[in-house]
Protein backbone atom coordinates (compact mmCIF):
# COMPACT_ATOMS: atom_id res chain seq x y z
CA UNK A 1 0.00 0.00 0.00
CA UNK A 2 1.33 3.58 -0.36
CA UNK A 3 2.70 5.26 2.72
CA UNK A 4 0.46 8.24 3.75
CA UNK A 5 1.02 11.55 3.27
CA UNK A 6 -2.01 12.82 6.12
CA UNK A 7 -2.72 11.10 9.29
CA UNK A 8 -5.71 11.23 11.91
CA UNK A 9 -6.37 13.79 14.11
CA UNK A 10 -3.82 12.91 17.66
CA UNK A 11 -1.02 11.28 15.20
CA UNK A 12 1.53 12.14 13.16
CA UNK A 13 3.53 11.14 10.08
CA UNK A 14 7.15 9.76 10.80
CA UNK A 15 9.32 7.80 8.06
CA UNK A 16 6.01 7.47 5.89
CA UNK A 17 4.02 6.39 8.88
CA UNK A 18 1.23 7.38 10.88
CA UNK A 19 2.46 7.02 14.97
CA UNK A 20 -0.04 8.13 17.76
CA UNK A 21 0.72 11.25 19.85
CA UNK A 22 1.56 11.35 23.50
CA UNK A 23 -1.47 12.27 25.42
CA UNK A 24 -1.37 15.81 27.42
CA UNK A 25 0.80 15.18 30.38
CA UNK A 26 2.97 12.77 28.92
CA UNK A 27 6.57 13.42 26.73
CA UNK A 28 8.32 11.14 23.33
CA UNK A 29 10.46 8.47 24.27
CA UNK A 30 10.56 6.73 20.97
CA UNK A 31 8.25 6.96 17.89
CA UNK A 32 6.67 4.22 16.78
CA UNK A 33 7.75 1.37 14.09
CA UNK A 34 6.08 -1.08 11.95
CA UNK A 35 5.97 -3.42 14.64
CA UNK A 36 5.32 -0.95 18.05
CA UNK A 37 3.60 1.68 18.99
CA UNK A 38 4.93 5.02 19.88
CA UNK A 39 6.51 5.13 23.11
CA UNK A 40 5.55 8.02 25.71
CA UNK A 41 6.71 8.75 29.75
CA UNK A 42 4.84 10.87 32.22
CA UNK A 43 6.34 14.64 32.62
CA UNK A 44 8.19 15.08 35.86
CA UNK A 45 7.08 16.69 38.69
CA UNK A 46 6.84 20.40 38.46
CA UNK A 47 6.37 19.81 34.65
CA UNK A 48 3.57 19.67 31.98
CA UNK A 49 2.72 19.34 27.96
CA UNK A 50 -0.74 20.57 27.89
CA UNK A 51 -1.79 19.17 24.03
CA UNK A 52 -1.27 15.99 22.31
CA UNK A 53 2.38 15.97 21.79
CA UNK A 54 5.28 14.82 20.01
CA UNK A 55 7.89 16.65 22.30
CA UNK A 56 10.72 14.49 23.82
CA UNK A 57 10.85 17.22 26.70
CA UNK A 58 7.97 18.59 29.18
CA UNK A 59 7.76 22.02 29.57
CA UNK A 60 8.62 23.36 33.56
CA UNK A 61 5.60 25.17 35.88
CA UNK A 62 5.95 28.99 35.53
CA UNK A 63 6.97 29.95 39.05
CA UNK A 64 4.18 32.85 41.01
CA UNK A 65 7.80 34.72 42.76
CA UNK A 66 6.28 36.20 45.90
CA UNK A 67 9.65 38.63 45.52
CA UNK A 68 7.93 39.86 42.34
CA UNK A 69 4.29 40.49 43.99
CA UNK A 70 2.61 37.26 42.52
CA UNK A 71 0.77 34.33 44.09
CA UNK A 72 -0.55 31.05 42.70
CA UNK A 73 -4.06 31.55 41.18
CA UNK A 74 -4.55 27.92 40.00
CA UNK A 75 -1.55 25.24 40.85
CA UNK A 76 -0.01 23.80 37.75
CA UNK A 77 -0.21 19.97 36.85
CA UNK A 78 0.91 17.50 34.18
CA UNK A 79 -1.56 18.77 31.76
CA UNK A 80 -1.69 22.48 32.76
CA UNK A 81 0.83 24.85 33.94
CA UNK A 82 0.67 27.09 36.95
CA UNK A 83 -1.61 30.07 36.64
CA UNK A 84 -0.27 33.27 38.68
CA UNK A 85 -1.92 36.39 39.30
CA UNK A 86 -1.16 39.60 41.69
CA UNK A 87 -1.32 39.91 45.62
CA UNK A 88 -3.85 42.10 46.99
CA UNK A 89 -3.41 45.75 46.01
CA UNK A 90 -1.29 45.08 42.41
CA UNK A 91 -1.89 43.77 39.15
CA UNK A 92 -0.12 41.88 36.57
CA UNK A 93 2.67 44.23 34.25
CA UNK A 94 1.53 41.84 31.10
CA UNK A 95 -0.79 38.92 30.17
CA UNK A 96 1.84 36.48 30.84
CA UNK A 97 1.74 37.88 34.45
CA UNK A 98 5.43 37.61 35.18
CA UNK A 99 5.44 40.89 37.50
CA UNK A 100 3.55 42.80 38.82
CA UNK A 101 2.89 47.12 39.82
CA UNK A 102 0.51 48.49 42.59
CA UNK A 103 -2.68 49.56 41.34
CA UNK A 104 -3.11 53.21 40.14
CA UNK A 105 -5.13 55.60 42.58
CA UNK A 106 -7.10 57.86 41.10
CA UNK A 107 -6.44 61.89 42.00
CA UNK A 108 -8.58 64.55 43.44
CA UNK A 109 -10.82 65.39 40.64
CA UNK A 110 -11.77 62.02 39.26
CA UNK A 111 -13.31 58.97 40.36
CA UNK A 112 -12.77 54.99 39.95
CA UNK A 113 -14.77 54.07 36.60
CA UNK A 114 -13.52 50.40 37.42
CA UNK A 115 -11.93 49.06 40.37
CA UNK A 116 -8.59 46.89 39.61
CA UNK A 117 -8.47 43.29 39.50
CA UNK A 118 -5.50 41.01 39.78
CA UNK A 119 -4.69 41.45 35.66
CA UNK A 120 -5.97 45.05 35.26
CA UNK A 121 -5.29 48.52 36.69
CA UNK A 122 -7.65 50.92 38.16
CA UNK A 123 -9.79 52.97 35.15
CA UNK A 124 -10.53 56.23 36.41
CA UNK A 125 -12.85 58.99 34.89
CA UNK A 126 -13.31 62.72 35.37
CA UNK A 127 -15.66 63.16 37.93
CA UNK A 128 -18.48 65.33 35.74
CA UNK A 129 -20.62 68.19 36.92
CA UNK A 130 -22.86 67.67 39.91
CA UNK A 131 -19.95 65.14 41.24
CA UNK A 132 -16.25 65.62 43.15
CA UNK A 133 -13.80 63.58 44.59
CA UNK A 134 -11.70 65.12 47.20
CA UNK A 135 -9.29 61.82 47.63
CA UNK A 136 -6.32 60.19 45.84
CA UNK A 137 -8.34 56.63 45.67
CA UNK A 138 -8.01 52.87 43.94
CA UNK A 139 -11.51 52.56 45.43
CA UNK A 140 -13.57 56.22 45.44
CA UNK A 141 -16.34 56.52 42.70
CA UNK A 142 -16.99 60.33 42.49
CA UNK A 143 -19.95 61.46 45.02
CA UNK A 144 -22.81 63.72 43.49
CA UNK A 145 -22.57 67.19 45.40
CA UNK A 146 -25.10 67.67 47.98
CA UNK A 147 -28.08 69.04 47.45
CA UNK A 148 -28.96 72.08 49.11
CA UNK A 149 -32.78 72.21 49.02
CA UNK A 150 -33.36 68.89 50.00
CA UNK A 151 -31.91 70.32 53.42
CA UNK A 152 -33.95 73.25 53.15
CA UNK A 153 -30.54 75.42 52.84
CA UNK A 154 -28.92 76.89 50.33
CA UNK A 155 -25.61 77.35 48.18
CA UNK A 156 -23.16 79.05 49.45
CA UNK A 157 -20.08 78.00 47.74
CA UNK A 158 -20.15 76.27 44.34
CA UNK A 159 -18.61 72.63 43.77
CA UNK A 160 -15.96 71.93 41.97
CA UNK A 161 -14.85 68.83 40.70
CA UNK A 162 -12.63 68.68 43.90
CA UNK A 163 -15.24 69.90 46.29
CA UNK A 164 -18.49 69.55 47.39
CA UNK A 165 -20.72 72.56 47.62
CA UNK A 166 -21.17 74.57 50.81
CA UNK A 167 -25.12 74.67 52.03
CA UNK A 168 -25.80 77.34 53.95
CA UNK A 169 -29.23 79.44 55.85
CA UNK A 170 -31.43 80.70 53.81
CA UNK A 171 -31.68 84.30 54.18
CA UNK A 172 -35.27 85.49 55.62
CA UNK A 173 -36.49 88.89 54.60
CA UNK A 174 -38.05 91.05 57.43
CA UNK A 175 -41.47 91.74 57.57
CA UNK B 1 8.46 0.71 50.58
CA UNK B 2 7.67 4.35 50.73
CA UNK B 3 9.02 5.73 53.97
CA UNK B 4 9.57 9.00 55.27
CA UNK B 5 10.85 9.51 58.53
CA UNK B 6 10.39 12.74 60.34
CA UNK B 7 13.14 14.25 63.43
CA UNK B 8 14.78 17.21 64.65
CA UNK B 9 11.62 18.03 66.83
CA UNK B 10 11.86 18.72 70.83
CA UNK B 11 11.35 21.72 73.37
CA UNK B 12 12.22 24.91 72.41
CA UNK B 13 11.77 28.45 74.07
CA UNK B 14 9.67 31.43 71.88
CA UNK B 15 11.98 33.18 70.07
CA UNK B 16 14.15 30.32 69.21
CA UNK B 17 15.39 28.16 66.10
CA UNK B 18 14.91 23.98 65.23
CA UNK B 19 15.60 22.55 62.48
CA UNK B 20 13.35 19.44 61.15
CA UNK B 21 14.57 16.83 58.88
CA UNK B 22 13.14 14.26 56.76
CA UNK B 23 14.92 11.21 55.32
CA UNK B 24 13.05 9.28 52.49
CA UNK B 25 13.42 6.41 51.42
CA UNK B 26 11.43 3.18 48.97
CA UNK B 27 11.43 5.49 45.60
CA UNK B 28 13.57 8.27 44.03
CA UNK B 29 13.04 11.29 46.03
CA UNK B 30 14.31 13.69 43.37
CA UNK B 31 11.05 12.79 41.66
CA UNK B 32 9.12 14.56 43.48
CA UNK B 33 7.63 17.84 45.50
CA UNK B 34 7.98 17.42 49.06
CA UNK B 35 5.78 19.47 51.45
CA UNK B 36 5.55 20.10 55.08
CA UNK B 37 2.15 20.59 56.97
CA UNK B 38 1.58 20.63 60.73
CA UNK B 39 -1.25 19.70 63.16
CA UNK B 40 -1.74 21.53 66.36
CA UNK B 41 -2.58 19.18 69.61
CA UNK B 42 -6.02 17.83 69.32
CA UNK B 43 -6.78 20.77 65.85
CA UNK B 44 -6.45 20.01 62.15
CA UNK B 45 -4.26 19.77 59.59
CA UNK B 46 -2.37 23.06 58.45
CA UNK B 47 -0.07 23.29 55.52
CA UNK B 48 3.39 25.15 55.80
CA UNK B 49 5.87 24.81 53.03
CA UNK B 50 6.26 23.15 49.29
CA UNK B 51 9.60 22.19 47.28
CA UNK B 52 9.22 21.15 43.74
CA UNK B 53 11.57 18.23 42.99
CA UNK B 54 14.20 19.88 41.87
CA UNK B 55 14.08 23.37 44.22
CA UNK B 56 13.20 25.60 41.80
CA UNK B 57 9.31 26.24 42.78
CA UNK B 58 8.65 26.81 46.80
CA UNK B 59 5.76 28.73 48.33
CA UNK B 60 4.99 29.10 51.79
CA UNK B 61 2.11 29.55 54.36
CA UNK B 62 1.90 33.34 55.48
CA UNK B 63 1.80 32.00 58.93
CA UNK B 64 5.79 31.30 58.69
CA UNK B 65 6.55 33.50 55.41
CA UNK B 66 10.10 35.16 56.65
CA UNK B 67 10.65 32.84 59.42
CA UNK B 68 10.49 29.18 58.14
CA UNK B 69 12.77 27.69 55.30
CA UNK B 70 11.81 24.58 53.32
CA UNK B 71 14.89 23.10 51.52
CA UNK B 72 15.89 19.84 50.20
CA UNK B 73 19.20 17.53 49.17
CA UNK B 74 18.64 15.10 46.77
CA UNK B 75 21.93 13.55 46.50
CA UNK B 76 20.84 12.69 50.60
CA UNK B 77 17.29 11.63 49.96
CA UNK B 78 16.39 14.35 52.75
CA UNK B 79 14.25 17.15 53.35
CA UNK B 80 14.74 19.97 55.41
CA UNK B 81 12.66 22.74 57.56
CA UNK B 82 14.60 25.84 59.31
CA UNK B 83 12.37 27.45 61.60
CA UNK B 84 13.54 30.54 63.27
CA UNK B 85 11.15 33.28 65.62
CA UNK B 86 9.19 30.41 67.10
CA UNK B 87 6.59 31.50 68.63
CA UNK B 88 3.92 29.06 71.12
CA UNK B 89 1.58 28.77 68.22
CA UNK B 90 3.87 27.08 66.09
CA UNK B 91 3.59 23.99 68.71
CA UNK B 92 2.39 21.11 66.38
CA UNK B 93 3.35 17.46 65.05
CA UNK B 94 5.23 18.87 61.86
CA UNK B 95 4.44 16.18 58.86
CA UNK B 96 6.55 15.64 55.68
CA UNK B 97 4.86 14.12 52.68
CA UNK B 98 5.79 14.13 49.08
CA UNK B 99 3.68 14.80 45.79
CA UNK B 100 4.16 12.91 42.70
CA UNK B 101 3.80 14.42 38.92
CA UNK B 102 0.72 12.89 38.28
CA UNK B 103 -2.25 12.89 40.75
CA UNK B 104 -0.63 16.22 42.64
CA UNK B 105 -1.87 15.30 45.97
CA UNK B 106 0.19 14.51 48.70
CA UNK B 107 0.08 10.55 48.71
CA UNK B 108 2.52 9.39 51.52
CA UNK B 109 3.26 11.00 54.81
CA UNK B 110 5.78 10.88 57.27
CA UNK B 111 4.72 10.24 61.20
CA UNK B 112 5.80 13.64 62.43
CA UNK B 113 7.80 14.94 64.70
CA UNK B 114 6.39 17.29 67.73
CA UNK B 115 7.74 21.03 68.05
CA UNK B 116 6.87 22.40 71.50
CA UNK B 117 7.59 26.44 71.77
CA UNK B 118 7.11 26.88 75.48
CA UNK B 119 8.69 29.26 78.38
CA UNK C 1 -7.09 32.11 50.72
CA UNK C 2 -9.35 29.16 49.63
CA UNK C 3 -11.63 28.43 52.89
CA UNK C 4 -12.78 24.89 53.40
CA UNK C 5 -15.63 23.82 55.37
CA UNK C 6 -16.77 20.63 56.12
CA UNK C 7 -19.97 18.81 58.05
CA UNK C 8 -20.57 17.97 60.26
CA UNK C 9 -17.62 18.35 62.98
CA UNK C 10 -18.54 14.64 64.00
CA UNK C 11 -20.94 11.70 63.62
CA UNK C 12 -21.73 8.33 65.27
CA UNK C 13 -23.03 5.78 62.65
CA UNK C 14 -23.97 2.41 63.16
CA UNK C 15 -21.60 -1.00 61.73
CA UNK C 16 -22.47 -1.09 58.17
CA UNK C 17 -24.57 2.08 57.76
CA UNK C 18 -23.82 4.74 55.32
CA UNK C 19 -21.49 7.87 56.27
CA UNK C 20 -21.98 11.07 54.42
CA UNK C 21 -18.99 13.87 54.72
CA UNK C 22 -19.72 17.19 53.36
CA UNK C 23 -17.01 19.84 52.54
CA UNK C 24 -17.59 23.78 50.73
CA UNK C 25 -14.83 25.46 49.52
CA UNK C 26 -15.11 29.05 49.20
CA UNK C 27 -14.09 29.28 45.13
CA UNK C 28 -14.21 26.56 42.51
CA UNK C 29 -11.41 24.17 42.74
CA UNK C 30 -11.94 22.92 38.78
CA UNK C 31 -8.86 23.59 36.69
CA UNK C 32 -9.77 25.01 33.73
CA UNK C 33 -7.48 23.31 31.60
CA UNK C 34 -8.07 19.47 32.34
CA UNK C 35 -11.92 19.86 33.95
CA UNK C 36 -10.45 17.85 37.25
CA UNK C 37 -12.04 19.15 40.07
CA UNK C 38 -8.78 19.17 42.47
CA UNK C 39 -10.10 18.37 45.96
CA UNK C 40 -8.78 15.57 47.87
CA UNK C 41 -9.61 13.62 51.56
CA UNK C 42 -7.46 12.80 53.47
CA UNK C 43 -8.02 10.20 56.61
CA UNK C 44 -6.25 9.96 59.78
CA UNK C 45 -6.77 7.30 62.34
CA UNK C 46 -6.21 7.76 65.86
CA UNK C 47 -2.25 8.04 67.02
CA UNK C 48 -1.58 7.60 63.22
CA UNK C 49 -0.51 10.12 60.09
CA UNK C 50 -2.89 11.04 57.13
CA UNK C 51 -3.42 9.43 54.57
CA UNK C 52 -4.50 10.12 50.95
CA UNK C 53 -7.81 8.32 50.02
CA UNK C 54 -9.17 9.97 47.54
CA UNK C 55 -7.76 12.73 45.16
CA UNK C 56 -9.26 14.44 42.09
CA UNK C 57 -13.28 14.51 43.87
CA UNK C 58 -13.51 11.21 43.46
CA UNK C 59 -10.50 8.79 42.22
CA UNK C 60 -9.79 6.46 44.66
CA UNK C 61 -5.97 5.68 45.60
CA UNK C 62 -4.47 2.23 45.11
CA UNK C 63 -5.39 0.08 48.10
CA UNK C 64 -8.49 1.95 49.15
CA UNK C 65 -11.66 0.04 49.71
CA UNK C 66 -14.75 0.50 46.95
CA UNK C 67 -17.10 1.29 50.14
CA UNK C 68 -15.30 4.95 49.70
CA UNK C 69 -16.58 7.46 46.96
CA UNK C 70 -16.05 11.09 46.28
CA UNK C 71 -18.57 13.14 44.13
CA UNK C 72 -19.42 17.18 43.82
CA UNK C 73 -17.97 19.70 41.47
CA UNK C 74 -17.03 22.85 41.50
CA UNK C 75 -17.44 24.24 45.50
CA UNK C 76 -19.94 21.57 46.89
CA UNK C 77 -17.99 17.80 47.74
CA UNK C 78 -19.21 14.74 49.46
CA UNK C 79 -17.22 11.70 50.85
CA UNK C 80 -19.69 8.46 51.43
CA UNK C 81 -18.39 5.78 53.20
CA UNK C 82 -21.41 2.91 52.15
CA UNK C 83 -21.16 0.74 55.00
CA UNK C 84 -19.05 1.68 57.94
CA UNK C 85 -16.73 -0.56 59.29
CA UNK C 86 -14.76 -0.86 62.88
CA UNK C 87 -11.30 -0.12 60.68
CA UNK C 88 -12.94 3.46 59.19
CA UNK C 89 -12.67 4.97 63.11
CA UNK C 90 -10.90 8.32 61.75
CA UNK C 91 -10.89 11.78 61.36
CA UNK C 92 -11.51 12.95 57.82
CA UNK C 93 -10.47 16.03 55.87
CA UNK C 94 -11.21 17.62 52.53
CA UNK C 95 -8.56 19.74 51.39
CA UNK C 96 -8.21 22.40 48.32
CA UNK C 97 -5.27 20.84 46.13
CA UNK C 98 -6.38 23.84 43.15
CA UNK C 99 -3.93 26.34 44.45
CA UNK C 100 -1.80 27.58 47.42
CA UNK C 101 -1.72 27.91 49.88
CA UNK C 102 -3.01 24.29 50.19
CA UNK C 103 -6.40 24.62 52.43
CA UNK C 104 -7.93 21.88 54.68
CA UNK C 105 -11.47 21.18 56.26
CA UNK C 106 -12.01 21.60 59.97
CA UNK C 107 -12.10 17.71 60.22
CA UNK C 108 -15.15 15.15 60.30
CA UNK C 109 -15.02 12.37 63.56
CA UNK C 110 -16.14 9.50 62.54
CA UNK C 111 -16.81 6.77 65.34
CA UNK C 112 -19.27 3.93 65.66
CA UNK C 113 -22.61 4.27 67.22
Known amino acids: PEPPTACREKQYLINSQCCSLCQPGQKLVSDCTEFTETECLPCGESEFLDTWNRETHCHQHKYCDPNLGLRVQQKGTSETDTICTCEEGWHCTSEACESCVLHRSCSPGFGVKQIATGVSDTICEPCPVGFFSNVSSAFEKCHPWTSCETKDLVVQQAGTNKTDVVCGPQDRLRA | EVQLVESGGGLVKPGGSLRLSCAASGFTFSDYGMHWVRQAPGKGLEWVAYISSGNRIIYYADTVKGRFTISRDNAKNSLYLQMNSLRAEDTAVYYC????????????WGQGTLVTVSS | DIVMTQSPDSLAVSLGEKVTINCKSSQSLLNSGNQKNYLTWHQQKPGQPPKLLIY???TRESGVPDRFSGSGSGTDFTLTISSLQAEDVAVYYC?????????FGGGTKVEIK
Open chain 2, 97 to 108: ARQDGYRYAMDY
Open chain 3, 95 to 103: QNDYTYPLT
Open chain 3, 56 to 58: WTS
